[in-house]
Amino acid sequence: ESALITQQDLAPQQRAAPQQKRSSPSEGLCPPGHHISEDGRDCISCKYGQDYSTHWNDLLFCLRCTRCDSGEVELSPCTTTRNTVCQCEEGTFREEDSPEMCRKCRTGCPRGMVKVGDCTPWSDIECVHKESGTKHSGEVPAVEETVTSSPGTPASPCSLSG
């Protein structure tokens, strides 16, 4: 964390060693990339690569940068004004209902269904019924047959585990 610039008019126990860039709050708020000092007089810069703030704020601590998990790639690094942007590796996706982990995309659609959407970092492959065109829920039955490129070969169960 960053520290306060000393000011002559501060009480001694509210001072700290001069280290980081300082500006004054505007109407009690500090700009993105800063947090407010505990005496409300200074805006203290966040530490690049360690923490950040995205909006005008009265935060006492900048927000901690996210670290990309294994199975994720870093699209853009954490700056003082923007959090790290992480994305699931190729072949995996992050679901809205389980955003904490990347899950493996299915390798193919169940029998009787056709693929209409590819695996992306934010969605599994999309399957629809050949006849009706209705979407498959994505929930895999206990034993699911997967359409493979070579007819007659035994179908392998899909794995959704990440």
Epitope: A17, Q19, E38, G40, D58, F61
Partner: antibody, heavy 117, light 108 residues
Framework: EVQLLESGGGLVQPGGSLRLSCAAS????????MSWVRQAPGKGLEWVSA????????YYADSVKGRFTISRDNSKNTLYLQMNSLRAEDTAVYYC??????????WGQGTLVTVSS | EIVLTQSPGTLSLSPGERATLSCRAS???????LAWYQQKPGQAPRLLIY???SRATGIPDRFSGSGSGTDFTLTISRLEPEDFAVYYC?????????FGQGTKVEIK
């Protein structure tokens, strides 16, 4: 002279609620971040919660998150701690303190909260 | 969270002796956000040192603080009778704010 005076402590049953107050004087209250720190009988100090000068940002220890709410009324120079779903392990002397990060440079005398059936 | 470990747990010394109290952090702490407190039975804590080495208002110069990174020290150069108490270190570098478990300085 900076003064902090806590009130509102007492005996409460598990699951009950209590609201602590801290009346501040001797400094520009609305400018300063304020905190609550507690001390269980015979134990060390534990930071509980903090709030920015304007009241716009609040922080909590994991042990009280979702149960305690810190707030302030800058027109009354008063800091509050609303404590809900109290547990036996919340039994402690609760101190109001000025500051949060660099130091707690002034402390109140403390108010005892006892959670017991 | 940053865990602060104070040692020794108890220090038995005589008035006039030098006391050296240690505070070790589980990860690096900015010196600007390391403080020391004294607490006597039945009283609220009192700020002694802030910014790792700066004495708070009204604190005698026999109290001094030093250190950086993960190792910090509070030194009382010559113990006075009123210095026998419990001492706590505290960090505000990271959330949550944490205290050490305390070191008791008792009369030998």
């Amino acid at each position: 002279e900076v003064q902090l005076l806590e009130s509102g402590g007492g005996l409460v049953q598990p699951g009950g609620s209590l609201r602590l107050s801290c009346a501040a004087s001797g400094f520009t209250f609305s400018s300063y971040a304020m905190s609550w720190v507690r001390q269980a009988p015979g134990k060390g100090l534990e930071w509980v919660s903090a709030i920015s000068g304007s009241g716009g940002s609040t922080y909590y220890a994991d042990s009280v998150k979702g149960r305690f709410t810190i707030s302030r009324d800058n027109s009354k120079n008063t800091l509050y701690l609303q404590m809900n779903s109290l547990r036996a392990e919340d039994t402690a002397v609760y101190y109001c303190a000025k500051g949060v990060r660099i130091s707690f440079d002034y402390w109140g005398q403390g108010t005892l909260v006892t959670v017991s059936s | 969270e940053i865990v602060l470990t104070q040692s020794p747990g108890t220090l038995s010394l005589s008035p006039g002796e030098r006391a050296t109290l240690s505070c070790r952090a589980s990860q690096s702490v900015s010196s600007s956000y390391l403080a020391w407190y004294q607490q006597k039975p039945g009283q609220a804590p009192r700020l002694l040192i802030y910014g790792a080495s700066s004495r708070a208002t009204g604190i005698p110069d026999r109290f001094s603080g030093s250190g950086s990174g993960t190792d910090f020290t509070l030194t009382i150069s010559r113990l006075e009778p009123e210095d026998f108490a419990v001492y706590y270190c505290q960090q505000g570098s990271n959330q949550p704010v944490t205290f050490g478990q305390g070191t008791k300085v008792e009369i030998k």
